[in-house]
Interface confidence: medium
């Protein structure tokens, strides 16, 4: 009974401060919260991880430690505080009955209390053949010292650092953070133990078979020989990598998690907290065959998440498993039979598959962009990183159906060479997670902290939304859509851009009483246009006759059905400048596409006319799709007319900036 | 040793009401086990009514046997299945199974029901 | 609803012979598919869990394969013991997805 559409369990138990009179009783009203993974086999009760509020000193984390367990001692309970955390996450690891919880929701600074979890290695580890190293390849950019400026930590299994692909590039930590090997008939053997993580390295940063030739590695032991571990050994690893990078700052630093658990709120946070502090954090999908988003660090927003594919750039199979997939995933990459050292001996080479192959690769392209670049920010590396992999190669009938349009069809890819994208406007499109069914509901969308939002949009697959509006919230904007009576529920699709010292803000018009439409421009001085976005609160849109129509000459004007608001993205930026490009066809059609032309970037992706026939819109790379309702439900041949707009956009200030650096 | 039996079932009249026990031994319940009821009317096949989990007390029914059909777990050792508004259709050897998880990848499992009680009679007439 | 089907509802074959068991999903149910035995007025017994893997004691005679909605369960070399009904039974995210009965209808094997 795993449930696989399982949703993050929370369970919320009320704060009774009455009890014990705390000293420090925690804030009128606020609950602490307590979370487990969704997955029951995966559960490890007993030991928990106590996260405290952010800005929790470390005494007041020993002090709240301490009075845990002074209280339980009062009740008869032992506890034991296993780590208590600092540098990454404020809080404190216990091993403690599950009957403390409800004391321990109550403590002073307690933000909320995960109960700890397994991870998992991301490879199949069987059926694995002994093959000779790959040929050097002369038609692939292969510079020789790649990655050369770049440290890759590894946090996987034990590896063997002689190996002769490895030898001199790993460097082993004395961390080590793993659980006891499950079953009494258990014996290590370390080629076993060392297998998944020798075989990463290797295809990180392999002498032979490579990625980065030249970047140097550190490992961490956070899976057993068995290629398990737990969350909080994984969270105590990133808090030594972060430690160890306060301690002695280097160059630019990737961490590799080549392993998946449940959804994990608190590991997530400490992904989120190391990805701020300048760290790429490159993860595996996962290997089941599912949402991605349902597993960490998978899930974690700020994380690099790569997902799977073989050389036919099919979606890797796994016996009956095969990647996971879904809006989560960033890009795929290699994963299926990948040539890399085997810890059966230093000279051996193994086939390994799986998301942590596939990450590795990744990983390992990071490290070649960043040493190349090593100024570039985790945004800008992931937007290289989407804007030079293979597009629309993935057969995205492997994945259900429902997951098809939120799977970025993206195979990643080194750059073909490392400098001269510089000019380019980047952008990617975000999509929200569902809003859900229930009439009011509404889903979000949201940039990465440095990423502009240049446009909104939404999609629902019954057609039943009330479109979508940019609103401020935490001083950034986001993209917000709305479901509507009847609904299955919508996603928001948030177009992400890079553009430097941008200032946008959006500019609404009400619903116009007049029949030819509600329209807004940009009225600011040297703002541009680079996104329109519907919002309507009627329930339904009528056919909007006469058609809206673009008045010739006023490309900074988004229009649309008189009963909606329209929202016009407007942003001044140096050297910055869009055009609007549409595609109407009279006739009623499934799909509709408008794509940007070379050297343009697209920012926004709307539908004209907003009428309730069409499901949405959504960027796909440089390409603006409308769906619309099945053709054989549309009513008459107007209704069903339909017009894609894409907002293109250029920067010649960038453009201008890469020519004087060449 | 373990095992599971089950008691409570006889004869009951069309309408009335019945709840089945479910006894282990030999193992206690961990959040590892799924709990659960089959039934068998005679000479037909195995039908699925629903199971428990043994970790957080979740629930989950075959489409029919929502609202007549309530599953419990009273103790660490017993799980009861409640009936109510029972007909003659409902008559059949009632099974408790024991669901446990297989491990067969990295993190993959899937569950089957390792442990059956010999099952316990219910007969719904007038 | 989630509704298995089993197909044939009875076979003969003698001592030494092979028999197919077909089980199939109305919908895809990955691997998530057992195997039960259950020979008259006793209880069901595992033979095949993951849709292949044997469970514990049982022969390597019993092979189970199929991923996704079609399965199959092969007797060979089969002896008078293996005269029983045989289920498959699907266990694919019962809580979140809705079942008629987990179970197919059974297979009853005849061996002369």
């Known amino acids: 009974q795993e449930d696989e559409d399982g949703d993050y369990e929370e369970l919320v138990l009320a704060l009774r401060s009455e009890e014990d009179g705390l000293a420090e009783a925690p804030e009128h009203g606020t609950t602490a919260t307590f979370h487990r993974c969704a997955k029951d086999p995966w559960r490890l009760p007993g030991t928990y991880v106590v996260v405290l509020k952010e800005e929790t000193h470390l005494s007041q984390s020993e002090r709240t430690a301490r009075r845990l367990q002074a209280q339980a001692a009062r009740r008869g309970y032992l506890t034991k505080i296993l780590h208590v955390f600092h540098g990454l996450l404020p809080g404190f690891l216990v091993k403690m009955s599950g009957d403390l919880l409800e004391l321990a929701l109550k403590l002073p600074h307690v933000d909320y209390i995960e109960e700890d979890s397994s991870v998992f290695a991301q490879s199949i580890p069987w059926n694995l053949e002994r093959i000779t190293p790959p040929r050097y390849r002369a038609d692939e950019y292969q510079p020789p010292d790649g990655g050369s400026l770049v440290e890759v930590y590894l946090l996987d299994t034990s590896i063997q650092s002689d190996h002769r692909e490895i030898e001199g590039r790993v460097m082993v930590t004395d961390f080590e953070n793993v659980p006891e090997e499950d079953g009494t008939r258990f014996h290590r053997q370390a080629s076993k133990c060392d297998s998944h993580g020798t075989h990463l390295a290797g295809v990180v940063s392999g002498r032979d078979a490579g990625v980065a030739k030249g970047a140097s590695m550190r490992s961490l032991r956070v899976l057993n020989c068995q290629g398990k571990g737990t969350v909080s050994g994984t969270l105590i690893g990133l808090e030594f990598i972060r430690k160890s990078q306060l301690v002695q700052p280097v160059g630019p630093l990737v961490v590799l998690l080549p392993l998946a658990g449940g959804y994990s709120r608190v590991l997530n946070a400490a992904c989120q907290r190391l990805a701020r502090a300048g760290v790429v954090l490159v993860t595996a999908a996962g290997n089941f065959r599912d949402d991605a988003c349902l597993y960490s660090p998978a899930s974690a927003p700020e994380v690099i998440t790569v997902g799977a594919t073989n050389a036919q750039d099919q979606p890797v199979t796994l016996g009956t498993l095969g990647t996971n997939f879904g809006r989560c995933v960033d890009l795929f990459a290699p994963g299926e039979d990948i040539i890399g050292a085997s810890s059966d001996c230093s000279t051996c080479f193994v086939s390994q598959s799986g998301t942590s192959q596939a990450a590795a690769h990744v990983a390992g392209i990071a490290a070649m962009m960043l040493s190349a670049e090593p100024e570039l920010t985790l945004a800008e590396l992931r937007q290289r990183l989407i804007h030079f992999s293979a597009k629309d190669v993935i057969n995205e009938a492997w994945f259900p159906e429902d997951q098809r349009v939120l799977t970025p069809n993206l195979v990643a890819a080194l750059p073909p060479s490392t400098h001269g994208a510089g000019w380019q406007l980047f952008c990617r499109t975000v999509w929200s997670a569902h809003s859900g069914p229930t009439r009011m509901a509404t889903a979000v969308a949201r940039c990465a902290p440095d990423e502009e939002l240049l446009s909104c949009s939404s999609f629902s697959r019954s057609g039943k939304r009330r479109g979508e509006r940019m609103e401020a919230q935490g001083g950034k904007l986001v993209c917000r859509a709305h479901n509507a009576f009847g609904g299955e529920g919508v996603y928001a699709i948030a177009r992400c851009c890079l553009l430097p010292q941008a200032n946008c803000s959006v500019h609404t018009a009400p619903p116009a009483e007049a029949s030819m439409g509600t329209r807004v421009h940009c009225h600011q001085q040297g703002h541009v246009l680079t996104g329109c976005s519907s919002h309507w609160e009627v329930e339904d849109l009528g056919t909007h006759k006469p058609p809206v129509l673009r008045p010739r000459g006023q490309p900074n004007q988004c229009v649309g059905h008189r009963e909606a608001s329209i929202h016009a993205s407007c942003c001044h930026a140096p050297g910055l400048e869009c055009k609007v490009k549409e595609h109407g066809i009279p006739a009623p059609q499934e799909q509709v596409t408008v794509a940007c032309e070379e050297g343009w970037t697209l920012t926004g992706c709307s539908a004209l006319p907003g009428t309730s026939h069409v499901l949405g819109a959504y960027a796909v790379d440089n390409t603006c799709v409308v769906r619309s309702r099945d053709v054989s439900t549309t009513g008459s041949t107007s209704e069903g007319a339909v017009t894609a707009v894409a907002i293109c956009c250029r920067s010649r200030h960038l453009a201008q900036a890469s020519q004087e650096l060449q | 040793q373990e095992q599971l039996v089950e008691s409570g079932g006889g004869l009951v009249q069309p309408e009335g009401s019945l709840t089945l026990t479910c006894t282990a031994s030999g193992f206690s319940f961990t959040s590892d086990y799924y709990m659960c009821w089959v039934r068998q009317a005679p000479g037909k096949g195995l039908e699925w009514i629903g199971c428990?989990?043994?970790?957080?007390?979740?629930t989950y029914y075959a489409s029919w046997a929502k609202g007549r059909f309530t599953i419990s777990k009273p103790s660490s050792t017993t799980v009861t299945l409640q009936m109510t508004r029972l007909t003659a259709a409902d008559t059949a050897t009632y099974f408790c199974?024991?669901?446990?998880?297989?491990?067969?990848?990295?993190?993959?499992?899937?569950?089957?029901?390792?442990?059956w009680g010999p099952g316990t009679l219910v007969t719904v007439s007038s | 609803d989630i509704v298995m089907t089993q197909t044939p509802a009875s076979v003969s074959e003698p001592v030494g012979g092979t028999v197919t068991i077909n089980c199939q999903a109305s919908e895809s149910i990955r691997n998530y598919l057992s195997w039960y035995q259950q020979k008259p007025g006793q209880r069901p017994k595992l033979l095949i869990y993951?849709?292949?893997t044997l469970a514990s004691g049982v022969p390597s005679r019993f092979k189970g394969s199929g991923s996704g909605t079609d399965f199959t369960l092969t007797i060979s070399d089969l002896e008078c013991a293996d005269a029983a009904t045989y289920y498959c039974q699907s266990n694919y995210g019962i809580s979140s997805r809705s079942y008629v009965n987990g179970f197919g209808g059974g297979t009853e094997v005849v061996v002369k």
């Open positions: 428990i989990s043994t970790g957080d007390g979740s």
């Open positions: 199974a024991r669901d446990r998880y297989y491990s067969y990848a990295y993190g993959a499992y899937v569950y089957a029901s390792d442990l």
């Open positions: 993951g849709a292949s």
